[in-house]
């Protein structure tokens, strides 16, 4: 009786279980009662990453430098090329098909998380007691200067964009 299901790494065709092609190879012809499955290696710059019955290999992704992309992992017959972005840029999607410049955090905001090749800068507002007076993709919020520890007094209050201004204490004569 012909099988209705096949073992792992096999597929059912013409009431027969045929071996799948291994990663890195494509299907040329199905097996028969008398012959094995015929597979052929993928060409250069092509791949198949699973046991398969594909008749065409997939093309390697191109990490186009004009789009800010660079190769993170070279493609092989069994794996696709993995792209990432040049320094200072990050991918616009999970597939990393193009890159955009890392965003900077405006004055009053600090960097909570520095950007990577795949994620943008995460900014946070500077809380009371902290400030940022620059637009930066790296700078965190800095704490206000402690006038007391310098034996000075606050002459001008700090904001989320400016540090406190310290001055000498008024001395009673």
């Amino acid at each position: 009786e012909p099988p209705t299901a096949c073992r792992e790494k096999q597929y059912l065709i013409n009431s027969q279980c045929c071996s799948l092609c291994q990663p890195g190879q494509k299907l040329v012809s199905d097996c028969t009662e008398f012959t094995e499955t015929e597979c052929l290696p993928c060409g250069e710059s092509e791949f198949l990453d699973t046991w398969n019955r594909e008749t065409h290999c997939h093309q390697h992704k191109y990490c186009d430098p004009n789009l800010g992309l660079r190769v993170q992992q070279k493609g092989t017959s069994e794996t696709d090329t993995i792209c990432t972005c040049e320094e200072g840029w990050h991918c616009t999607s999970e597939a990393c098909e193009s890159c955009v410049l890392h965003r900077s955090c405006s004055p009053g905001f600090g960097v909570k998380q520095i950007a990577t090749g795949v994620s943008d800068t995460i900014c946070e507002p500077c809380p009371v007691g902290f400030f940022s007076n620059v637009s930066s993709a790296f700078e965190k919020c800095h704490p206000w200067t402690s006038c007391e520890t310098k034996d000075l007094v606050v002459q001008q209050a700090g904001t989320n964009k400016t540090d406190v201004v310290c001055g000498p204490q008024d001395r009673l004569r």
Epitope: E44, S45, D49, C63, Q73, T76
Partner: antibody, heavy 119, light 113 residues
Framework: EVQLVESGGGLVKPGGSRRLSCAAS????????MHWVRQAPGKGLEWVAY????????YYADTVKGRFTISRDNAKNSLYLQMNSLRAEDTAVYYC????????????WGQGTLVTVSS | DIVMTQSPDSLAVSLGERVTMNCKSS????????????LTWHQQKPGQPPKLLIY???TRESGVPDRFSGSGSGTDFTLTISSLQAEDVAVYYC?????????FGGGTKVEIK
């Protein structure tokens, strides 16, 4: 028998141009990726550029980006390297090398051609 | 870019002796998809072009004598010649075949003592 034969080397003035060729035989050229690799006199190996079998994918070393152009003509079984704005530091033996779709390594190298950049 | 560091720069060994050279990469050469380390060794004899010796860290190219063996994973790799022959005098280069730009080590020169 696999053969890669480079030509086009010689003496060039700084700022000048040169076009190197690599003639391939003994294998189906259009099935293979190709590289250029150079070796300065008495120094180690430096990868220069890669072109995929079907011309679709091209990568360059930062040291030559914008100055060198790799290309191929599968009908003529030939690989090329157009070198512009040459500098003294480009002086080297230039090798072409083949990359197959199995190992993904440079499995055959040509004998090389010497490019000397000097005034 | 991945930096490949070879050691020693050179070594002189008697015929028939064992030769070991090392190669260190600044980042892992392990392909996450197929679990192969893309580290390649090339041999360059005096006055000749390089020749592929070993790929995927430990797979000998066809025609390469079995006295040559490669080992390692991740960032640390070794090339061993079990019994040095006169024809093995050469410079041996390890190469990152994992990502572009492809990068080579500075080479290890093997001479006869």
């Amino acid at each position: 028998e696999v053969q890669l034969v480079e030509s086009g080397g010689g003496l060039v003035k700084p700022g000048g141009s040169r076009r190197l060729s690599c003639a391939a035989s003994g294998f189906t050229f259009s099935d293979y990726g190709m590289h250029w690799v150079r070796q300065a006199p008495g120094k180690g190996l430096e990868w220069v550029a890669y072109i995929s079998s079907g011309n679709r994918i091209i990568y360059y070393a930062d040291t030559v980006k914008g100055r060198f152009t790799i290309s191929r003509d599968n009908a003529k079984n030939s690989l090329y390297l157009q070198m512009n704005s040459l500098r003294a530091e480009d002086t080297a033996v230039y090798y072409c090398a083949r990359q197959d779709g199995y190992r993904y390594a440079m499995d055959y190298w040509g004998q090389g051609t010497l490019v000397t950049v000097s005034s | 870019d991945i930096v490949m560091t070879q050691s020693p720069d050179s070594l002189a060994v008697s015929l028939g002796e064992r030769v070991t050279m090392n190669c260190k990469s600044s980042q892992s050469l392990l392909n996450s998809g197929n679990q192969k380390n893309y580290l390649t060794w090339h041999q360059q004899k005096p006055g000749q072009p390089p020749k592929l010796l070993i790929y995927w860290t430990s797979t000998r190219e066809s025609g390469v004598p079995d006295r040559f063996s490669g080992s390692g994973s991740g960032t640390d790799f070794t090339l061993t010649i079990s019994s040095l022959q006169a024809e093995d005098v050469a410079v041996y280069y390890c190469q990152n075949d994992y990502t572009y730009p492809l990068t080579f080590g500075g080479g290890t020169k093997v001479e006869i003592k």
